[in-house]
């Protein structure tokens, strides 16, 4: 039994790290393999993860970690019974993939402005709580080419956009993801999307002027 692609891990920097690897051939990951991990510290428990299959030869393991600090380092040992297949280490702070933002809501009743809000997925005592910035993806449900990304480079989990920038009488969807620049993280997964109907109508004067102008051509 051989490891074809060594484990690579990412951490949400609160409680969960996910490691993935590929074996040399079809493997029943949960029956044949164990990933043992331990924090390099004075008082730390040895933990064991039972991997799941990710395709015929791929394995994935969810490592539970608690109270992470920036300097944390874990030893990782991949076992097949009594045989040590691979030995490595993992520093969560250097491989951060934030949790996805939660509770994305779109408010359409704020005059001619769309207000999108979501919640930071971290509690206030976590380092990432004050470090996340966001990207919001808005797209037209009926036209895949009508899609845009808004970079939210401030920390407030809100975005205001003019309803007039979107097509009137169309259903739109939005989703949001996060990253932590200071920890050189990857982007989080996208949040679940939320849907709304853009009922914005152009003001009469503008509409009338537009129509008149058109008539002369």
């Amino acid at each position: 039994m051989k490891v074809l692609q060594e484990p690579t891990c990412v951490s949400d920097y609160i409680s969960l790290s996910t490691c993935e690897w590929k074996m040399g051939g079809p493997t029943n990951c949960s029956a044949e393999l164990r990933l043992v991990y331990q924090l390099v510290f004075l008082i730390s428990e040895t933990n064991m993860c039972v991997p799941e299959n990710n395709g015929a030869a791929g394995c994935v393991c969810h490592l539970f970690m608690e109270d992470m600090v920036g300097a944390d380092n874990y030893t990782l040992d991949l076992w097949a019974g009594q045989q040590l297949l691979w030995k490595g280490s993992f520093k969560p702070s250097e491989h951060v993939k934030p949790k996805a933002p939660e509770n994305l809501t779109v408010y359409t009743n704020v005059s001619e402005t769309l207000l999108l809000t979501w919640s930071n997925p971290y509690p206030p005592d976590n380092y990432l709580y004050e470090k996340l910035t966001y990207a919001v993806n808005i797209w037209n449900e009926n036209d895949p080419t009508d899609s845009r990304i808004y970079d939210v480079t401030y920390q407030e989990p809100t975005l205001r956009i003019a309803a007039s920038t979107l097509k009137s009488g169309v259903s739109y969807r939005a989703r949001v993801r996060a990253w932590a620049q200071s920890y050189n993280s990857t982007w989080s997964e996208w949040s679940p999307s939320t849907k709304w109907y853009n009922a914005y109508k152009e003001p009469f004067e503008k509409h009338h002027h537009h129509h008149h102008h058109h008539h002369h051509h």
């Epitope: 609160i14 409680s15 510290f41 109270d67 920036g70 300097a71 944390d72 509690p123």
Partner: antibody, heavy 116, light 112 residues
Framework: EVQLVQSGAEVKKPGATVKISCKVS????????MHWVKQAPGKGLEWVGR????????IYASKFQGKATITADTSSNTAYMELSSLRSEDTAVYHC?????????WGQGTLVTVSS | DIVMTQTPLSLSVTPGQPASISCRSS???????????LEWYLQKPGQSPQLLIY???NRFSGVPDRFSGSGSGTDFTLKISRVEAEDVGVYYC?????????FGQGTKLEIK
């Protein structure tokens, strides 16, 4: 052997500032959160705040926001707490404690007395 | 803030007899990672506190097995199966799940 050795007792006048230290041996402070806990004379324990020495990220109990400032020097493996605008109610023993992820190691405490 | 309420506030026990201290939190102390960071500390006279129990039920290394922790949700209990003279001091429960972290007001254990 793990030791958290705190600086000696301090007597300060109201309005003054005091900075107390907690020198750690036996482990690297970057590997834990360093917390401070207050114990007023004859009273119970009160959590003040904590620091992640790796990145300097601090968090405080709201009543100590603006009162306490926690810092850490990883090169000397020492945590500090500064208390400003001292008043008589700040008179207490202050303990430094490492938490990973529970309070396993405590300093011996530093008595700060505020008296005119 | 989460308030941790201990009962009783004082306890006088004959050596060899059991003792029980209750700790109630004003709201759930389950952390977002699923753990319950409920701990028990003993502060012996003239000493710094020492850890007895972590995560509700786990005895810290070197703690005698006469100490046990139990509970869930908002109600937690520390039991000493047979009190010994060295157990005197003030016992504190503590929640480390939600900032600001909070201690109970303490329970003083004396020997009869």
């Amino acid at each position: 052997e793990v030791q958290l050795v705190q600086s000696g007792a301090e007597v300060k006048k109201p309005g003054a500032t005091v900075k107390i230290s907690c020198k750690v041996s036996g482990f690297n402070i970057k590997d834990t959160y360093m917390h401070w806990v207050k114990q007023a004379p004859g009273k119970g324990l009160e959590w003040v705040g904590r620091i992640d020495p790796t990145n300097g990220y601090t968090i405080y109990a709201s009543k100590f926001q603006g009162k306490a400032t926690i810092t850490a020097d990883t090169s000397s493996n020492t945590a500090y707490m500064e208390l400003s605008s001292l008043r008589s109610e700040d008179t207490a023993v202050y303990h430094c404690v490492s938490r990973r992820p529970w309070f396993a190691y405590w300093g011996q405490g530093t008595l700060v007395t505020v008296s005119s | 803030d989460i308030v941790m309420t201990q009962t009783p506030l004082s306890l006088s026990v004959t050596p060899g007899q059991p003792a029980s201290i209750s700790c109630r939190s004003s709201q759930s102390i389950v952390h977002s990672n699923g753990n319950t960071y409920l701990e028990w500390y003993l502060q012996k006279p003239g000493q710094s506190p020492q850890l007895l129990i972590y995560k509700v039920t786990n005895r810290f290394s070197g703690v005698p097995d006469r100490f046990s922790g139990s509970g869930s949700g908002t109600d937690f209990t520390l039991k000493i199966s047979r009190v010994e003279a060295e157990d005197v001091g003030v016992y504190y429960c503590f929640q480390g799940s939600h900032v600001p972290y909070t201690f109970g007001q303490g329970t003083k254990l004396e020997i009869k």
